[in-house]
């Protein structure tokens, strides 16, 4: 039974997006009053762990030795006083990466692009995906991504700029992920560096509408043709 | 450390069959193809097909459809690949390799192959 | 299918040198959907497995030493090296991904002059 309590601050350790084969600390912290802490895992059977307070029982470790595929997913943790549980933390989303191949980025016309001007940031999967991101380094909020409508899987998705300002400038790279767990990400592209020039300058750059495509009949090599409806994929801002 | 470690030679009679397993580790098996190369004595590489681990899904070379066949063990993380009716021309040094894009940036040791009556 | 055809079929270089190996295929490989040509470049060492070089005709991959470099686009493709070592002592192969079946040039033995 859910009491008074203050709710623990739930975090990860050196982050909550590890690489497949890394190791990661879950940290719960509560109060001095807690005698135990349960760290639950969203669709697996509660509770996931248990631990004993640190000194000064204020907080609880729990270690993943190895990063793998199980061990990801969304967390919560509660602490136990004398007075029964405190409310559920905040949820901790534990992402790995390097589940699948390495997708590849490209900016087309060229990473080269005029102030003013329009570029496509093209991501591209190895086997077909249901969701692109892109990541911007260094920037406020740098996940974007692209999830199919309807679950249908395609092989790459396109992240239109327009019109390209300064502030679009910067290192980007991408990820692919399978819908049945957007907790499994590939390993990221090889980066790709966006140079803008020229002096027109828009403070709050919008991306256009996001659109992915199924393979082109000729020129999409090593991809299946006709195999994927052309359904758009929803984009998404984080 | 991604390895592909690879099962010991081979030494067959024509028409026979063989199976090479391809053991991975050091990274995530289901999400990444493996593919089979052959390297005859003193030869260049020939692509023989791919097996996806995660659903099973594999691909052919022409040359060796209806030969060769790739199965996988999620439970061990292996990959195998049996070549049937053999004959004096498939011998050689058989290579698992891991698909990046298309090309492959990890490959298993070799598995010698020697078909002699 | 894509043949892969490279020149020559054997060079002998001394060290310290440039070594050069060309890499010609029978239909272009670059995609017009993303501008990138889809070849790569291995390295075979005597009883070793090939070793991967350089994805993307030019893409030199981690861990691989700075004079190793690839160039071209289309039809023709390079591989440069620009300053021999005796490790770089190999045969080298490219291969085009833009079509099934893979398909690998012949090989290039490179040897020490």
């Known amino acids: 039974q859910a009491g008074p309590l203050p709710k623990p601050t739930l975090w990860a350790e050196p982050g909550s997006v590890i690489s497949w084969g890394n190791s990661v600390t879950i940290w719960c912290q509560g109060t001095l009053e807690a005698r135990e802490y349960r760290l639950d895992k969203e669709e697996s059977p509660a509770p996931w762990d248990r631990q004993n307070p640190l000194e000064p029982k204020n907080k609880a470790r729990f270690s993943i030795p190895s990063m793998t595929e199980d061990y990801a997913g969304r967390y919560r943790c509660y602490y136990r006083s004398p007075v029964g549980w405190s409310q559920p933390s905040d949820p901790l989303e534990l992402v790995m990466t390097g589940a699948y191949s390495k997708p590849t980025l490209s900016a087309l016309p060229s990473p080269l692009v005029t102030s003013g001007k329009s570029v496509t940031l093209l991501c591209q999967s190895r086997s077909p995906m249901d969701t692109f991101l892109l990541i911007k380094e260094r920037a406020a909020h740098p996940l974007l991504h692209l999830r199919s409508e309807h679950g249908a899987q395609q092989h790459q998705a396109e992240f239109p700029m327009s019109p390209v300002t300064s502030v679009h400038g910067g290192t980007y790279r991408c990820f692919s992920s399978h819908g049945f767990s957007h907790y499994l990400l590939s390993h990221p592209s090889d980066p790709l560096e966006l140079i803008v020039s020229g002096s027109l300058e828009d403070p709050r750059p919008s991306p256009t509408r996001s659109v992915s495509t199924a393979a082109g009949p000729e020129d999409q090599p090593l991809m299946p043709t006709g195999s994927v409806p052309h359904s758009g994929l929803r984009r998404h801002w984080e | 450390e991604v390895q592909l470690v690879q099962s010991g030679a081979e030494v067959k009679k024509p028409g026979a069959s063989v199976k090479v397993s391809c053991k991975a580790s050091?990274?995530?098996?289901?999400?990444?193809?493996i593919d089979w190369v052959k390297q005859p004595p003193g030869k260049g590489l020939e692509w023989i097909g791919y097996?996806?681990?995660?659903?099973?899904?594999?691909s052919y070379n022409q040359k060796f459809k209806g030969r060769a066949t790739m199965t996988v063990d999620k439970s061990t993380s292996t990959v195998y690949m049996e070549l049937s009716s053999l004959r004096s021309e498939d011998t050689a040094v058989y290579y698992c390799?891991?698909?990046?894009?298309?090309?492959?940036?990890?490959w298993g040791q070799g598995t010698t192959v020697t078909v002699s009556s | 299918d894509i043949v892969m055809t490279q020149s020559p079929d054997s060079l002998a270089v001394s060290l310290g040198e440039r070594a050069t190996i060309n890499c010609k295929s029978s239909?272009?490989?670059?995609?017009?959907?993303?501008?990138?040509?889809?070849l790569a470049w291995y390295q075979q060492k005597p009883g070793q497995a090939p070793r991967l070089l350089i994805y993307?005709?030019?893409t030199r991959e981690s861990g691989v030493p700075d004079r190793f470099a690839g160039s071209g686009s289309g039809t023709d493709f390079t591989l440069t090296i620009s300053s021999l070592q005796a490790e770089d002592v190999a045969v080298y192969y490219c291969?085009?991904?833009?079509?099934?079946?893979?398909?690998f040039g012949q090989g290039t033995k490179l040897e020490i002059k």
């Open positions: 390799a891991r698909q990046a894009f298309y090309y492959f940036d990890y």
């Open positions: 050091g990274y995530s098996f289901s999400g990444f193809y």
């Open positions: 097996i996806f681990p995660s659903n099973g899904e594999t």
């Open positions: 239909q272009s490989l670059l995609s017009s959907s993303n501008q990138k040509n889809y």
């Open positions: 993307w005709a030019s």
């Open positions: 291969q085009q991904y833009y079509s099934y079946p893979l398909t």
